[in-house]
Amino acid sequence: MAVTACQGLGFVVSLIGIAGIIAATCMDQWSTQDLYNNPVTAVFNYQGLWRSCVRESSGFTECRGYFTLLGLPAMLQAVRALMIVGIVLGAIGLLVSIFALKCIRIGSMEDSAKANMTLTSGIMFIVSGLCAIAGVSVFANMLVTNFWMSTANMYTGMGGMVQTVQTRYTFGAALFVGWVAGGLTLIGGVMMCIACRGLAPEETNYKAVSYHASGHSVAYKPGGFKASTGFGSNTKNKKIYDGGARTEDEVQSYPSKHDYV
C-alpha cells in the first residue's frame, strides 16, 4: 500500500513538475526590466527564450520573436536546448510511468517489469528536473553578469549619436517557475526510484518442485532454484542432485501413486 502511494505521489509530483517546466519554457518573463532608477522610459520590457515584449502603462503589449538564430547568445541556445531536453525526457518518463503504476493492470505484466519501468521513469524525471534547474540557472547567471548599472555614454556612432543605456534586467517569474518545477520533477523522480525498490519482489530460496521416487533410496536436496528480482546477481539454475529429483521446469512428471507435490 505504501509503495503504491509513493509511486502514485511520485507520478503526480513529476506531472506537476513537467507541466511547470513546459510553462516556464513558454513564458516570456525570463528577464524583466528593472524599472528602478531607469533613465530611459516608463515602458516595461520583458524577455523570454523565444521573444521580446514591451508593455505600456495603458496595457498595450507588443511581442516580437527573435528572428535569427545567428545573432542570439550561445548561452540562450544552451538554455533552450536544456529546457527542451528536460521536457522531452519528462514526457517520455510520464509515458513510461503510466504503464509502471501498480494500480494499473496491463495484461500479465510482472512486478519485476513494473519495477524496472518505475526505476526508468524515476531516472528520467531526475534528469529532466536537473536539465530544467540547469537551464534556469544558466539564464540566471546570464542575468547576473548583465546586471549593469544604467550608464549613458554618449559617443558618435555610424549615422549619428548613440546613447548606450545598458538597462538592467532582473529575474523574471519564469525563472522561479522553472526552479520550482525542476525541483518537483526531481523529487518525483526520487520518489519513483524509492517506490521501485518496494515493487521489486523479494528474493526467496524456495521453489515448488515435484520429484519422482526412484526404486532405491535417494537423498534429496531441495532448493534447486532461487527466485531473482532481476536486480541482484542472477543465481545460476543448477541441479543439486540428479537422483530422481526434478524441478517443474526440467521435466514434466507423470501422475503416479509415488508422486508427492
Epitope: 521580446s52 505600456e56 498595450f60 549619436m161 548606450t164 545598458q166
Partner: nanobody
Framework: EVQLVESGGGLVQAGGSLRLSCVAS????????MAWFRQTPGKQRELVAG???????NYADSAKGRFTISRDNAKKTIYLQMDSLKPEDTAVYYC??????????????WGQGTQVTVSS
C-alpha cells in the same frame, strides 16, 4: 547597428507647415518609444513630442495644439506634422528611439538631426 535617418527639414515662413519623418533601420526587436527632440545653439536638447508602440503620445507644452506626432510601426517610422510654425521653433530637430536590439539589450539611439528654420 541601429540607424535613425531624419528628413523633411528646411526653411519655411512663419505660420507655415512642415512634416518631418524619421526611419529606423538595423537589428531591431522592439521600439518602445520614438520621439522628437530639438536643440537651439547654447541650449539643452528638449523633448518636442514622443510616441509609444501602442500610440500613446506626449507633447511639450510649446508643441501642444500645433504639432502632431504619428507612427507607422510596420515601417519603423515616426512623423512630426508641424503647423502654425513660429520663429522660436527654429532649431535642429533630432529623432530619438528607445530600441530593444536583443536579449537584455535596450539602447537609446539618436539621429544626426535635421535643420528647421522659420523665418518671420
Amino acid at each position: 547597428e541601429v540607424q535613425l535617418v531624419e528628413s523633411g527639414g528646411g526653411l519655411v515662413q512663419a505660420g507655415g507647415s512642415l512634416r518631418l519623418s524619421c526611419v529606423a533601420s538595423g537589428t531591431i526587436l522592439n521600439i518602445p518609444l520614438m520621439a522628437w527632440f530639438r536643440q537651439t545653439p547654447g541650449k539643452q536638447r528638449e523633448l518636442v513630442a514622443g510616441i509609444t508602440t501602442g500610440g500613446t503620445t506626449n507633447y511639450a507644452d510649446s508643441a501642444k495644439g500645433r504639432f502632431t506626432i504619428s507612427r507607422d510601426n510596420a515601417k519603423k517610422t515616426i512623423y512630426l506634422q508641424m503647423d502654425s510654425l513660429k520663429p522660436e521653433d527654429t532649431a535642429v530637430y533630432y529623432c530619438n528611439a528607445d530600441v530593444v536590439t536583443g536579449l537584455m539589450r535596450r539602447n537609446v539611439y539618436w539621429g544626426q538631426g535635421t535643420q528647421v528654420t522659420v523665418s518671420s
